[in-house]
């Protein structure tokens, strides 16, 4: 679970009667509204390890829609447009937090869940294990 | 906020007295613990667009530690180890959910927050704007 700091001005979370749940305000504060949203824009097409984006939808989860990246090739695209299979296109994965409705279908009760998502792809040199 | 489905078996969230907060269980369920964690392992070093990982720590946030990627070069690394500046190393960014303590320092009250993080880097062909 979450390591909770103690603070004398707050309810005692170590009380044996204190629930393992917390209150979460659903009005999302977006700290990035003012940032330049260049994000990963068209990188998925221009990358030497291009990827497609697939919609992963789950109404029991928040966010209900997550876009997952899937590399287009096993190898990497060369300047001439051909694929070099001596290099590898690999997904960059990240563990993210989502909220899972618990009990199912109920709108005001959730459980934190960690899921691993593929965000995009990068081109790597393969690992070659040399036998002694 | 979150689009909340109606369900007759759950408390009425549209009640005017119903808070804009929900209960969240902090015992995190990890859906990917059983999978082969090939993850992004050492890709940050083996990529043609390598990156460094920087620790971003904030005790008022959960997760309190987030690792941010910063591309090592403007260009991409060639097979001979030199950097090709005709290509660009760019960060792949993703919007993620975090929990922000609100009021500050209190352990059992949070607000959902979206932040943009750089997960890794990919090598892209630059956009060339031709003047008419």
């Amino acid at each position: 679970g979450i390591a909770i700091p103690r603070n004398s001005g707050c309810p005692n979370s170590e009380d044996k009667n204190f629930p393992r749940t917390v209150m979460v305000n659903l009005n999302i504060h977006n700290r990035n509204t003012s940032t330049n949203p260049k994000r990963s824009s068209d990188y998925y097409n221009r990358s030497t390890s291009p990827w497609n984006l697939h919609r992963n939808e789950d109404p029991e989860r928040y966010p209900s829609v997550i876009w997952e990246a899937k590399c287009r090739h096993l190898g990497c695209v060369k300047a001439d447009g051909n694929v070099d299979y001596h290099m590898n296109s690999v997904p960059i994965q990240q563990e993210i937090l989502v909220l899972r409705r618990e009990p199912r279908h109920c709108p005001n009760s959730f459980r934190l869940e960690k899921i691993l998502v593929s965000v995009g792809c990068t081109c790597v040199t393969p690992i070659v294990h040399h036998v002694a | 906020g979150i689009a909340i489905p109606r369900n007759s078996g759950c408390p009425n969230s549209e009640d005017k007295n119903f808070p804009r907060t929900v209960m969240v269980n902090l015992n995190i369920h990890n859906r990917n613990t059983s999978t082969n964690p090939k993850r992004s392992s050492d890709y940050y070093n083996r990529s043609t667009s390598p990156w460094n990982l920087h620790r971003n720590e904030d005790p008022e946030r959960y997760p309190s530690v987030i690792w941010e990627a910063k591309c090592r070069h403007l260009g991409c690394v060639k097979a001979d180890g030199n950097v090709d500046y005709h290509m660009n190393s760019v960060p792949i960014q993703q919007e993620i959910l975090v929990l922000r303590r609100e009021p500050r320092h209190c352990p059992n009250s949070f607000r959902l927050e979206k932040i943009l993080v750089s997960v890794g880097c990919t090598c892209v062909t630059p956009i060339v704007h031709h003047v008419a």
Epitope: D58, K70, L74, P91, Q93, P126 | N32, N36, K38
Partner: antibody, heavy 126, light 112 residues
Framework: EVQLVESGGGLVQPGGSLRLSCAAS?????????MCWVRQAPGKGLEWIGC????????YYASWAKGRFTISRDNSKNTVYLQMNSLRAEDTAVYYC??????????????????WGQGTLVTVSS | DIQMTQSPSSLSASVGDRVTITCQAS??????LSWYQQKPGKAPKLLIY???TLTSGVPSRFSGSGSGTDFTLTISSLQPEDFATYYC??????????????FGGGTKLTVL
């Protein structure tokens, strides 16, 4: 416990159809897993049938399996299926369900299969 | 389709021996090759993927090498539990329409 359990095998007449199921437990199909089917005739070697990406539903088949064999999935049930039509005596085999070793976003199931079911026997005979 | 030719098809050896099994692809599959071990009545077990990467939990006496069309599985010092049938498998795909996961014919390793 992470496991795969096949079911649906049995005796079927030549020309008949059969649908095999593979139920996964201990991991969720949410995301990109490659789930594959492999068969083994009695006393013979392994024969790859095909795979499905649980994320986008893309299927990949051995050339000999295209047309007669169809792989599908139901992510809500964490189950993959193998629909077999126009069965012949030479389709008699133990059918295995297996999972590719790499999770998430690889272009193809290119990392070998690290998790296998116990297999289900299909006998095609009159 | 890519053809995978494994040799020898059968092999007798003793505990402590060094054993080598080869696998040849009919065209280049780069490093996209896996090796499996199968014992009678059991499902196969993945030993090596990407030609030389050992799967977690597999003893270090197993090693793989090769790229392109020629690959080798080596058991440096044979143990009693290693007597089984070994299969290689191509894991190479070029496009959704061209995909090859062909297995080799197998090598049955028995006690001399």
């Amino acid at each position: 416990e992470v496991q795969l359990v096949e079911s649906g095998g049995g005796l079927v007449q030549p020309g008949g159809s059969l649908r095999l199921s593979c139920a996964a437990s201990g991991f969720s199909f949410s995301g990109f897993y490659y789930m594959c089917w492999v068969r083994q005739a009695p006393g013979k070697g392994l024969e790859w049938i095909g795979c499905i990406d649980t994320g986008d539903g893309t299927t990949y088949y051995a050339s000999w399996a295209k047309g007669r064999f169809t792989i599908s999935r139901d992510n809500s049930k964490n189950t993959v299926y193998l629909q077999m039509n126009s069965l012949r005596a030479e389709d008699t085999a133990v059918y295995y369900c297996a999972r590719d070793a790499a999770y998430g976003g690889y272009a193809y199931p290119a990392h070998g299969m690290d998790l296998w079911g116990q297999g289900t026997l299909v006998t095609v005979s009159s | 389709d890519i053809q995978m030719t494994q040799s020898p098809s059968s092999l007798s050896a003793s505990v402590g021996d060094r054993v080598t099994i080869t696998c040849q692809a009919s065209e280049s599959i780069y490093r996209y090759l896996s090796w499996y071990q199968q014992k009678p009545g059991k499902a196969p077990k993945l030993l090596i993927y990407l030609a030389s990467t050992l799967t977690s939990g597999v003893p270090s006496r197993f090693s793989g090498s090769g790229s392109g069309t020629d690959f080798t599985l080596t058991i440096s010092s044979l143990q009693p539990e290693d007597f089984a049938t070994y299969y290689c498998q191509s894991n190479f795909g070029t496009a959704s329409t061209t995909y090859y996961n062909t297995f080799g014919g197998g090598t049955k390793l028995t006690v001399l």
